[in-house]
């Protein structure tokens, strides 16, 4: 498979997988934009949920993970026609009735007030002023997150974590 | 989201989205092993498909893709116990009614002998010895890939490709 | 290898209709959104139509709304256009294209070598 | 729908010259502008996306600059087989629109 864009480019060598020399700047990627501590992907395309995250997947990054209405308004305000919506990496856990991050978390009741029915093959988009529910089957714009994290140089193993 | 183990570490700076700055030397993360060209993290928890491949992408990495007999070879070698069985990025797509790899592309005939039903929610795992398939709602250990790709220090944007 | 192969032009009346087909090998094309650009003999390139990934959306260029219809077949490789009522500013090359990047629906890095489509009484 | 608005639609020069052609926006469209080029007989080519980036295998004497409204094609010491028409297009919405082409001529 060829890498596609937005992989990290190194150079290869043996026997390192353990060692922890790290650049000390890293750049987002042609067609990614850098948002604080995030390169993101807005997706010119369309596609359901399901095909949005394994293209993320294999961008080698995640559909959108957002943390506070703080990170949700910088998002939103990136977002220039109304009209237009963003898968993110949140959707129906049927199992467990609650709304569930790609990451393994639940929705916290203060962070995102989603519009829409909360049930089975429900997932969520954003748009410029609010936050959905729909179909998961329904074809949508995403948007692709990869994240970035201070260091410099050698750093403990820590900064994997 | 605190970053999870696997992100691209880096030194922030503002309004840098189109530089082509690269080190020209990064590691598989902790946890991680690399083989060959890739990194790989073989789960120790188990999930569903869709869950390993949700937390697959949150690490920023795919879940594994493989190429040809040799790297299934290569990978199985790396499972010390027999009764262990790991997802890989193989599915069977009803609507295509083909095995599908996440990147999109299909499984050739002379690829992988899956052993198991084609059907609708069929998903991959491999052991040491074989390739089965099994409903994606099964719960099962997973392998995350990031693919190295080799370049040294300032480089233009192919390296992306 | 990594080709486009388009077929199905020839000469057709006003009026009449043709199915162009293009066939895709060489990358993962169920996950790219895919288009349809012609030109006209001894004129620039013209966008027709493109279709999701997926292919539950697809747009259209003005000049062929509602006479042109783009589909796909992802279980094939294939990429269709179907082309009904045709009229003779219709006549040209059309060219199937891939993007180069699986989240745009432009940037064609791939091209097939094109089929004509002649429009004549 | 966006206009491109390709200049000269035709240049006349030498081999080694240095050509320059350009293209206009009727708004903005950030950095969504590929350049390609097309010999006769032949599909077009990509050689520039993102404005500026040069697509694998394509040499060097070829860059692009420009964002917003403004772009521009730059080919440094034009090589024989560089003798072909070239087209901008942007990518930032849809209908997806192609300048009307410059012709690059041997003089």
């Known amino acids: 498979q060829k890498p596609s864009i937005g992989k990290c480019s190194v150079d290869i060598q043996q026997n390192r997988t353990k060692t922890t020399e790290r650049p000390d700047l890293l750049n987002c990627p042609i067609y990614w934009q850098q948002v604080q501590e995030k390169c993101l992907l807005f997706s010119h395309t369309v596609n359901p949920w399901n095909n949005s995250l394994a293209d993320c997947s294999t961008k080698e990054s995640s559909l959108l993970l957002i943390q506070d209405k703080d990170e949700l308004t910088r998002t939103q305000n990136l977002i220039h026609d109304k009209a237009i919506s963003f898968w993110i990496g949140l959707n129906f856990s049927l199992s467990e009735k609650n709304w569930k991050w790609i990451n393994g978390s639940f929705l916290s009741s203060n962070d995102l007030k989603i519009t829409g029915d909360a049930k089975e093959n429900s997932c969520v988009y954003i748009s410029q002023t609010s936050v959905y529910s729909e179909y998961c089957s329904t074809e949508m714009k995403w948007i692709c997150q990869k994240e970035l994290t201070l260091v410099r140089n050698k750093v403990s193993p820590d900064s994997w974590l | 989201q605190k970053p999870s183990i696997g992100k691209c570490s880096v030194d922030i700076q503002q309004n840098r989205t189109k530089t082509t700055e690269r080190p020209d030397l990064l590691n598989c993360p902790i946890y991680w092993q690399q083989v060959q060209e890739k990194c790989l993290l073989f789960s120790h928890t188990v999930n569903p498909w869709n869950n390993s491949l949700a937390d697959c992408s949150t690490k920023e990495s795919s879940l594994l893709l493989i190429q040809d007999k040799d790297e299934l070879t290569r990978t199985q070698n790396l499972i010390h116990d027999k009764a262990i069985s790991f997802w890989i990025g193989l599915n069977f797509s009803l609507s295509e009614k083909n095995w599908k790899w996440i990147n999109g592309s299909f499984l050739s005939s002379n690829d992988l002998k899956i052993t198991g039903d084609a059907k609708e929610n069929s998903c991959v795992y491999i052991s040491q010895t074989s390739v089965y398939s099994e409903y994606c709602s099964t719960e099962m250990k997973w392998i995350c890939q990031k693919e190295l790709t080799l370049v040294r220090n300032k480089v233009s944007p192919d390296s992306w490709l | 290898e990594v080709q486009l192969l388009e077929s199905g032009g020839g000469l057709v009346q006003p009026g009449g209709s043709l199915r162009l087909s293009c066939a895709a090998s060489?990358?993962?094309?169920?996950?790219?959104?895919m288009s349809w650009v012609r030109q006209a003999p001894g004129k620039g390139l013209e966008w027709v139509s493109a279709?999701?990934?997926?292919?539950?959306?697809?747009y259209y260029a003005d000049s062929v709304k509602g006479r042109f219809t783009i589909s796909r077949d992802n279980s094939k490789n294939t990429l269709y256009l179907q082309m009904n009522s045709l009229r003779a500013e219709d006549t040209a090359v059309y060219y199937c294209?891939?993007?180069?990047?699986?989240?745009?629906?432009?940037?064609?890095?791939?091209w097939g070598r094109g089929t004509l489509v002649t429009v004549s009484s | 729908d966006i206009q491109m608005t390709q200049s000269p639609s035709s240049v006349s020069a030498s081999v080694g010259d240095r050509v320059t052609i350009t293209c206009r926006a009727s708004?903005?469209?950030?950095?969504?502008l590929a350049w390609y080029q097309q010999k006769p007989g032949k599909a077009p080519k990509l050689l520039i996306y993102?404005?500026?980036s040069l697509q694998s295998g394509v040499p060097s004497r070829f860059s692009g600059s420009g964002s917003g409204t403004d772009f521009t094609l730059t080919i440094s010491s034009l090589q024989p087989e560089d003798f072909a028409t070239y087209y901008c297009?942007?990518?930032?919405?849809?209908?997806?629109?192609f300048g009307g082409g410059t012709k690059v001529e041997i003089k």
């Open positions: 708004q903005g469209i950030d950095s969504w």
């Open positions: 060489g990358f993962a094309f169920s996950t790219y959104a």
């Open positions: 297009q942007q990518a930032s919405v849809l209908p997806i629109t």
């Open positions: 279709i999701s990934a997926a292919g539950g959306t697809t």
């Open positions: 993102a404005a500026s």
């Open positions: 294209a891939k993007p180069l990047d699986s989240s745009l629906w432009a940037d064609f890095d791939l």
